[in-house]
Interface confidence: low
């Protein structure tokens, strides 16, 4: 799904930091200002504006040191591996003054039998092996250290954990003569946490386990286990929280049922059912106890596992998630959509909204998209006037220093943000739609008309007259 969305309102780029002074010569000592803003309350917006201004004015003083890159560290414990037996690892960018740690789990579907794992190894080796991983990665979105791009947690220690286990971060089986592939997703997370304790995580105040897509589901499956691990290792004071992006899937009825042949057409329940056996998958203990043996697959679905979790979790989910539609065998090609499909899509949004009803910390825009938090322009989308970084900040505030979310929402600082309008892109801040196959940008109005929506209904929230909308449709403007 990389590069499939246009995020910033076009033509608008963040202003570059002012460069009014020369940067220090290489090797010249530079003072560091370790700052941590975990405890700041009150007028956060005004405070953040001042901090941004300070950060940008200090930029020329440390241009040499302002390296956005996260550096690769392969696990020292080489028995914890990717699918092909190569060592797993993580990318790290430390922020020594901060006691916040962000651990991000990458996404990228899964494979659940020898045949489709072989195919994945041929076509997407990076997701099964560390052999060709680059030495550095750039932190983007919530992993960015630039306050302009990441007004939420720019000062945190950033960790990107590449996905190379193909098991939705749930596996606990090593490569052997019997097993062609290792599936060690759950163990990789545990081992990364263990190694990071020696790199400063031991002094953390907050550990935010985040992830997108399969990584988002991975958060739901692992967040409580990480909290337990830290407790057992003697770090009960570290607050563990979860941020699950685009990993809250429904085990709904497919639009068109297909046999379970490959990853994408296999109904999610069946794929996970097979996967758990193949991966020796583990699920959160409290969830597992709610289901009979052989029914652990239920715990991969957000609305079933969430009520059993102890750690606070913030759920980010597009109401019309492209991956959800894909597994439901909905392929929007720009061809006119039958009434039945339109109703199916609308119903999907309605069902998803319903599953988030009792999730106090959630952000669900009515858009057709997939993943958001490590997109550079993750700040652009809003639900009812609130952006995701703002909602996350409000969530931080609502948690205070306790592990439990406070029941009373902070005035003017909402954390439950779920769009109520009923069709894709009725939210004016949605990212641009692209045709799934051609990659061409699609005009929203055109897209909605193809989906069979009534002109007046569609035109109004776009701030248009039906006649204008008709004109737009005829040329895709």
């Amino acid at each position: 799904s990389e590069g499939r969305k246009t995020w910033r309102r076009r033509g608008q780029q963040p202003p570059p930091p002012p460069r009014t002074e020369a940067a220090p010569a290489a090797g010249q000592p530079v003072e560091s200002f370790p700052l941590d803003f975990t405890a700041v309350e009150g007028n956060m917006d005004s405070f953040m504006a001042q901090v941004k201004s300070l950060a940008q004015s200090l930029y020329p003083c440390s241009a040499q040191q302002l390296n956005e890159d996260l550096r690769l560290h392969l696990l020292l414990n080489t028995s914890v591996t990717c699918n092909d037996g190569s060592p797993a690892g993580y990318y790290l960018k430390e922020s020594r003054g901060s006691r916040r740690w962000l651990l991000f789990l990458e996404g990228g579907w899964y494979c659940f039998n020898r045949e489709n794992c072989d195919s994945r190894y041929d076509t997407m080796r990076r997701l099964m092996s560390s052999r060709d991983w680059p030495r550095t990665r750039t932190g983007t979105g919530i992993l960015s250290s630039q306050p302009e791009e990441n007004p939420y947690w720019w000062n945190a220690n950033m960790v990107f954990i590449p996905y190379c286990s193909s098991d939705v971060w749930s596996g606990a089986s090593s490569k052997s003569e019997k097993n062609e592939y290792a599936f060690m997703g759950a163990l990789i997370i545990q081992e990364v946490v263990r190694e990071l304790l020696g790199r400063g995580l031991s002094g953390a105040k907050v550990l935010l386990l985040a992830g997108s897509s399969a990584g988002g589901t991975g958060v739901l499956l692992n967040v409580d286990r990480v909290a337990e691990q830290l407790e057992k290792l003697g770090y009960p004071a570290i607050q563990v929280r979860g941020l699950a992006d685009s990993g809250w899937f429904l085990d709904n009825k497919q639009y068109r049922h297909t046999d379970c042949v490959d990853t994408i057409t296999c109904a999610p329940t069946e794929a996970i059912r097979r996967g758990i056996r193949y991966w020796n998958g583990v699920v959160p203990e409290r969830c597992r106890r709610q289901f009979q043996e052989g029914e652990e697959w239920n715990c991969f679905f957000g609305y079933k596992v969430y009520p059993t979790l102890r750690c606070p979790v913030f759920v980010v989910q597009w109401l019309f998630d492209e991956a959800q539609l894909t597994v439901d065998n909905v392929h929007l090609t720009g061809q006119p959509v039958q009434e039945g499909l339109r109703l199916y899509i609308q119903n999907l949004g309605r069902e998803l909204r319903h599953t988030l009803k009792d999730v106090p910390a959630s952000f669900a825009p009515a858009c057709l998209s997939h993943e958001i938090i490590i997109r550079s322009h993750w700040t652009d989308v809003q639900v009812k006037g609130t952006s995701l970084p703002r909602a996350l900040h409000c969530w931080d505030r609502s948690l205070h220093d306790s592990h439990k979310a406070s029941k009373t929402p902070l005035k003017g600082c909402p954390v439950h943000l779920v769009d109520s309008c009923p069709w894709p892109h009725c939210n004016p801040s949605c990212p641009t739609v692209r045709d799934q196959f051609t990659g061409q940008e699609m005009n929203v109005a055109q897209f909605l008309m193809h989906m069979g929506f009534d002109m007046q209904t569609v035109a109004q929230p776009q701030g248009l007259e039906p006649s204008e909308l008709l004109g737009m449709l005829s040329n895709g403007s």
Partner: antibody
Framework: EVQLVESGGDLVKPGGSLKLSCAAS????????MHWLRQAPEKGLEWVAY????????SYANTMKGRFTISRDNAKKTLSLQMTSLRSEDTAIYYC????????????WGTGTTVTVSS | DIVLTQSPASLVVSLGQRATISCRAS??????????MHWYQQKPGQPPKLLIY???NLESGVPARFSGSGSGTDFTLNIHPVEEGDATTYYC?????????FGSGTKLEIK
Amino acid sequence: EVQLVESGGDLVKPGGSLKLSCAASGFTFSDYGMHWLRQAPEKGLEWVAYISSGSTTLSYANTMKGRFTISRDNAKKTLSLQMTSLRSEDTAIYYCARKNYNGGYFDVWGTGTTVTVSS
Amino acid sequence: DIVLTQSPASLVVSLGQRATISCRASKSVSESGYSYMHWYQQKPGQPPKLLIYLASNLESGVPARFSGSGSGTDFTLNIHPVEEGDATTYYCQHSRVLPPTFGSGTKLEIK
């Protein structure tokens, strides 16, 4: 740099005609709906006309319908406003502005060109 | 057409204090949780500059001293703390349907 620059403003007699132009740069002009707006001396802002990105939708303020014609050339990145049967009340600074995708606000404005209608 | 009534027509505020400008629409400019009201600042001899879009969103590069709120028919622009350079004219604009219309403007003076 995203920029809009108007030209063509002049002193013209009542009943006369004038063509204003707006040159765009720094963004993909063909992706955006464009507007003309105006401001009479010491007065507020008034919307004049709108053209969708592909020129299929044209819309005008009631007092300008039939007298003004909005057009665009995406290849040349230019927006035009042909004004005929001009009246003294058309005296104003004319601005071209870009309509933002997500909600119909004007996120980029030109510097304006002055049209004076007087005998 | 939707008529926007802006008030007050002029406003005098002390340096460092809060300036509040109101804009009332003749019919609702909100739909499905979104409010199609925007605010601009116009300095003499210059074109208007977008400050706030969709009622409460700060345009990139605009200081956080500016904020917008409201929904339905009643909207507010707040400036706090007011600075010398804020002394100029402010307009609200809706884009709920064509034609877009503007308020008559509020002239802010700093004392």
